[in-house]
Structures are given as C-alpha cells and as structure tokens.
Interface confidence: low
C-alpha cells in the first residue's frame, strides 16, 4: 500500500482526504490512527460517528477532526494547529466489526516556520488516542486523492445569506414602490441567525470544531 506524504506548516491546519469504494465500505465507520513504530499497532486518534448514517457529522478529538462523506466515498481528516509532535505515519481505516482495513497510509511532515525559533520539544501536543488499538495487519489498496471542497455548512450559510439579502432587497423594493399594504406581514424567509446556525451545529456535532 503506497504511502501519501503530506506536508503542513506548524501552527496551521492540514487537511487529509482518503477516498474509498463507497459500495464496498457501505455501513462501515472510519478511523484515523497513528502508527506506533514500523510494526506497531495503530493508535486510534479519532473515529467517525458511532451511527454510520450520521458519519457526515464532524467528530473531534483534541486538534483532530474527522468527517465522512459516505456517498462520495471520501473521509476527511483535519489536523488543526499542526505541531512538531504531530509528524509521523498515520492510517485511514475502515472499521468492520472488530477488524480494521487500511484505506490509506499517510506520512505527515511538519515544516517549521523559519520565523518561529520555539524549541520543537515544546510543541508536542498529545492527542487523546488509543494505542492498544492495533490496525488489522492485512491491507487492501484504495484510491487516494486530495479534495478541497468547502464544507456543506459553509455553502449552506452562504446560500442562506444571499437568499436573505435577496428577500430583504425585494421587500425594500416593494415598500419603496408603495405596494406594501398596511397590516400585511413581512415575509421572514430563512432565519439565518437561527436555522443556519443550527445547521452548522448539526454538521459539526455538539462539541463544534
């Protein structure tokens, strides 16, 4: 199984996308784990929602976020506030009962900001993870590509804002033309302050991101 090398700048976010056969992995949860040495078990960092149908919800563990688009066959992992201690070999896994199938091996390299002379030893931020949890040793290959589509929540918010502005402009135009009869209620349209916020909450899970 080929290893994908990804580089990120310390302090910034690194986005990892592992693609898989959506039909083959139907109903399976995904996990992101850190390899303990060349032959060691894979230390679980974060896994997708326990209910597979809710896998699109973002799950967070420390500075790592995971979300799975089960229809598109893409699981996305975001390593936020990348630190020197985050460098290492990781795996995207597909969980099947008590076994885990490796979707992709990812070598994360952290580049130090030349302006930041902070001692690398101080940059270690431990993540809550499970090192007991050895990845199943048998591997199967899968496609891998980088994707950088905006999250659904952002698109929804943008659409909501644009629609609200359009509705507001329409209403102002109608009022300006004097066609608004006294006592006629103003159309609320989408309440972006509430519904979109709630949608963001749903998409990021109760803990947010």
């Amino acid at each position: 199984l080929n290893t994908t090398v990804l580089q990120g700048m310390a302090g910034q976010s690194l986005r990892v996308s592992c693609t898989y056969d959506a039909l083959k992995h139907w109903g399976r949860r995904k996990a992101w784990c850190r390899q303990l040495g060349e032959e060691g078990p894979c230390q679980r960092v974060v896994s997708t929602h326990g209910v597979w149908l809710l896998a699109f919800l973002k799950k967070r563990n420390g500075s790592t976020v995971i979300a799975d688009d089960t229809l598109a066959g893409t699981v996305t992992i975001t390593l936020k506030n990348l630190q020197a201690g985050d460098a290492g070999l990781y795996q995207c896994q597909s969980l099947r009962g008590r076994e885990a199938e490796v979707l992709q091996k990812v070598l994360v390299e952290v580049l130090e900001d030349p302006l930041d002379d902070q001692d690398a030893g101080d940059l270690w931020v431990p993540e809550e993870s499970s090192s007991f949890e050895g990845a199943q040793v048998e591997h199967s290959t899968s496609r891998n590509q980088e994707t950088s589509f905006p999250p659904t929540s952002i698109l929804l918010l943008l659409a909501c804002v644009l629609l609200s502005k359009f509705l507001a402009a329409s209403i102002l135009w109608a009022v300006a033309r004097g066609r608004q009869k006294p006592g006629t209620p103003v159309v609320r349209g989408l309440d972006c302050g509430q519904d979109a916020g709630h949608q963001l909450q749903i998409l990021t899970g109760p803990g947010g991101t």
């Epitope: 032959e39 230390q43 885990a100 431990p126 499970s130 090192s131 007991f132 050895g134």
Partner: antibody, heavy 117, light 110 residues
Framework: QVQLVQSRAEVKKPGASVKVSCKAS????????MHWVRQAPGQGLEWMGW????????KYAQKFQGRVTMTRDTSINTAYMELSSLRSDDTAVYYC??????????WGQGTLVTVSS | QSVLTQPPSVSAAPGQKVTISCSGS????????VSWYQQLPETAPKLLIY???KRPSGIPDRFSGSKSGTSATLGITGLQTGDEADYYC???????????FGGGTKLTVL
C-alpha cells in the same frame, strides 16, 4: 469462536530458556497483533511486548529487551514467546492476548513457568 | 511499583454499587484511552471496558467506565458474589512507549 490455547506449565532452572506457545483459532491469525503479558504470583499484570504475526515485526518492553524473542508459525496459526537467561523472579503465569480494533479482547488461559534450582 | 495507581482493595454488599479508581499521568491516561480487565480467581484476565467507556459484547451494563483528565473510574452496580475478582486498568504510556497496567484492585462482595 475465537480461542487462544497456550502450552502447558514448565519448570526451568536458572539460566535456562523457556518457549511458550499460543495457538490461535476462530479468526485470521495474521490479521491481529499478539501481545504477551505476564503475572508473577500474587502480583499484577506486566506487559512484555507485541508481535505482528503478518510481518514478524516486534516491539518489546524495555525491561525484556535482549532476553525475549517473539516468533510465529503461520502454517499452524501459532505464536511463540521465548524468554532466556531465566531467573527466579521470572516465575510467573505468561499470557498471550490478541489486539485488533479492540485492545486485548481475547486472552490465552495462561502458562505457568516456574524457575527453580 | 505500577505506573497506574489503583486502591489495593474495595468492598461492598451484594446489590450495592462500587467504584474503582485508576490514577495516572499526562503521558498515559491523560493521553490515551483506558481499558479495564476483570480477573476471576485462577483464570485469565477478561476485557470489561475499552476506549474509556465502551463494553465488549457480552459484558452487562452493570459495568461502566469513565475518564477525566489523568484518572479513570470503573463502576459496578448491582454487585453480585460472582463479581469478586481482581480488576486492572490499562493504557498506553507514550513516555515509556509501553502498555502499562495498574497494580490491581481486589473486589470483595461482603
């Protein structure tokens, strides 16, 4: 169902070596890591190391480095743990334990190794 | 001396609830998931709880686990005489690069 069956009890003299076996059944042997844990009489659990039956790769606890060797025979789905230069304080029950996505989910019944002159 | 600290013994009457604590540090419990194991007399350990609070199939919901900071707790409700055993917590220690266990807690059902 998953089973880990270990070899019978052994009595060894100080300085000798012992090789404990752990036969796996009910699952894909090469698909899971095998750990070895020991327990001295009346004492707690002590981790010795893990073993990758697929590649033969190992990681040993620092305390046992140089004295322990973990191997396997995939043709008979069996893992082995050999401990050399035995001392009296190596007297213990030695367990093999499987680890997949769930840690140490199945254990062998244990093998008592007695080191006595 | 074990890396993880457990009380040597706890006791309670049948039907009661008991908790067993497991204290560690930022390099083990604070940095990883905790598992709990039950060892009945003269038998091999058995997995009770993994990932801090998950039960393997076949483990009754009388057993529960939790974690906060660098400490973990095993809870047992509706105590039965068959629960008399030694209980061990375990996790990974990133400093030692090893699996570590607590010293074990002997549960006595009065």
């Amino acid at each position: 169902q998953v089973q880990l069956v270990q070899s019978r009890a052994e009595v060894k003299k100080p300085g000798a070596s012992v090789k404990v076996s752990c036969k796996a059944s009910g699952y894909t042997f090469t698909g899971y890591y095998m750990h070895w844990v020991r327990q001295a009489p009346g004492q707690g659990l002590e981790w010795m190391g893990w073993f990758n039956p697929n590649s033969g790769g190992t990681k040993y606890a620092q305390k046992f480095q140089g004295r322990v060797t973990m191997t396997r025979d995939t043709s008979i789905n069996t893992a082995y743990m050999e401990l050399s230069s035995l001392r009296s304080d190596d007297t213990a029950v030695y367990y093999c334990a499987r680890t997949g996505v769930i840690p140490f989910d199945y254990w062998g019944q244990g093998t008592l190794v007695t080191v006595s002159s | 001396q074990s890396v993880l600290t457990q009380p040597p013994s706890v006791s309670a009457a049948p039907g009661q609830k008991v908790t067993i604590s497991c204290s560690g540090s930022s390099s083990n419990i604070g940095n990883d998931y905790v598992s709990w194991y039950q060892q009945l007399p003269e038998t091999a350990p058995k997995l009770l709880i993994y990932d801090n609070n998950k039960r393997p199939s076949g483990i009754p919901d009388r057993f529960s686990g939790s974690k906060s900071g660098t400490s973990a707790t095993l809870g047992i409700t509706g105590l039965q005489t068959g629960d008399e055993a030694d209980y061990y917590c375990g996790t990974w220690d990133s400093s030692l690069s090893a699996v570590v266990f607590g010293g074990g807690t002997k549960l006595t059902v009065l």
